[in-house]
């Protein structure tokens, strides 16, 4: 069976939107009005992995682009990147672990924990216009909580 996917946008808990910044980077910034069209639309695929009531494994691709968020070690540091894939083979139910995030719902907010690097989360800075990153903290300055907005196909 084909992998189930849905289209969505994500905003952090400060209401910053995610936009492309160059070919392989996402930034978080406040958008208004027509500028909202700049925000990236994700194709969130529900993939194989450890699952529970409030924890669902997903992959986050960029809609109609052969790019997926992935987690890799760079300079000994778990790092978030946008990785190109062969569109003939993706998305798939059994995604490589670097592409998998545990979508965790807490108090109507979502966290995205790396499956490859437990206790590392998709994060944004309090500062405007900074790259989205894989962060190792929760509950401090950096933001790990998101809301999801569904986008019709």
């Amino acid at each position: 069976a084909p992998v189930r996917s849905l289209n969505c946008t994500l905003r952090d808990s400060q209401q910053k939107s995610l936009v492309m910044s160059g070919p392989y980077e996402l930034k978080a910034l406040h958008l208004q009005g027509q500028d909202m069209e700049q925000q990236v639309v994700f194709s969130m695929s529900f993939v194989q992995g450890e699952e529970s009531n409030d924890k669902i494994p997903v992959a986050l691709g960029l809609k109609e682009k052969n790019l997926y968020l992935s987690c890799v070690l760079k300079d000994d540091k778990p790092t978030l990147q946008l990785e190109s894939v062969d569109p003939k083979n993706y998305p798939k139910k059994k995604m490589e672990k670097r592409f998998v995030f545990n979508k965790i719902e807490i108090n109507n907010k979502l966290e995205f924990e790396s499956a490859q690097f437990p206790n590392w989360y998709i994060s944004t800075s309090q500062a405007e216009n900074m790259p989205v990153f894989l962060g190792g903290t929760k509950g401090g300055q950096d933001i790990t909580d998101f809301t999801m907005q569904f986008v019709s196909s």
Epitope: D75, D76, K77, P78, P118, N119, W120, S123, S125, Q126, A127, N129, M130, P131, F133, G135, G136, T137, K138, G139, G140, Q141, D142
Partner: antibody, heavy 118, light 108 residues
């Protein structure tokens, strides 16, 4: 209020090790990156490494080639920095500081003077 | 490793005048630069974060600007307590975090 309180001054012989502590209070300890920065007499600031209390990840400045070990105790909100194989050039004030991911170090400990002398 | 170069090494300015510090990064760091003041015998103090963002408790006479590789810290009207050492630091690409070598602000 936010506080980082470090252990007291140390005098060590060359070849020995020193362990400096930094006790955090007034904030969510696991919500920040905890750094160690040193300053030799009359010199500038040098980043030594960091530890993330939330997941126990550590990374060091390559310059120290494995001489630095950073640990944490979440039960007491304390981070530790141990520097081994001490030499006279390690005489410095050692600071702990907290930051966000991009390294804005908004609170610092008072500093710990480590003197290495034979 | 990103190298941060501060200039000048020493800056001599009269009280009440404007002081301008420069910091250059060896590669593009966007706005991921922070400025610190260090008075003799004290720990560094964060003055400006993310190139131009204010820090709570820091007087309004301190401001920052720049992006990419060229950055400036300005003190609009020098007070006696401002004579100290000033450091820039990048957080764009780590490890390692790197500091500039510092600028000493002295009374002219």
């Amino acid at each position: 209020q936010v506080q980082l309180v470090q252990s007291g001054a140390e005098v060590k012989k060359p070849g020995a090790s020193v362990k400096v502590s930094c006790k955090a209070s007034g904030f969510s300890f696991t919500g920040y990156y905890m750094h160690w920065v040193r300053q030799a007499p009359g010199q500038g600031l040098e980043w030594m490494g960091l530890i993330i209390p939330h997941n126990d990840y550590t990374v060091n400045n390559q310059k120290f080639k494995g001489r630095v070990t950073m640990t944490r105790d979440t039960s007491t909100s304390t981070v530790y920095m141990e520097l081994s194989s001490l030499r006279s050039e390690d005489t410095a004030v050692y600071y702990c500081a907290r930051s966000d991911y991009y390294g804005a170090m908004d609170y610092w400990g008072q500093g710990t003077l480590v003197t290495v002398s034979s | 490793e990103i190298v941060m170069t501060q200039s000048p090494a020493t800056l001599s300015v009269s009280p009440g005048e404007r002081a301008t510090f420069s910091c250059r990064a060896s590669q593009n760091i966007g706005t991921s630069i922070h400025w610190y003041q260090q008075r003799p015998g004290q720990a560094p103090r964060l003055l400006i974060k993310y190139a131009s963002n204010d820090v709570e408790g820091i007087p309004a006479r301190f401001s920052g600007s720049g992006s990419g590789t060229e950055f400036t810290l300005t003190i609009s009207s020098l007070q006696s307590e401002d004579f100290a050492d000033y450091y820039c630091q990048q957080g764009s690409s780590w490890p390692p975090f790197t500091f500039g070598q510092g600028t000493k602000l002295e009374i002219k």
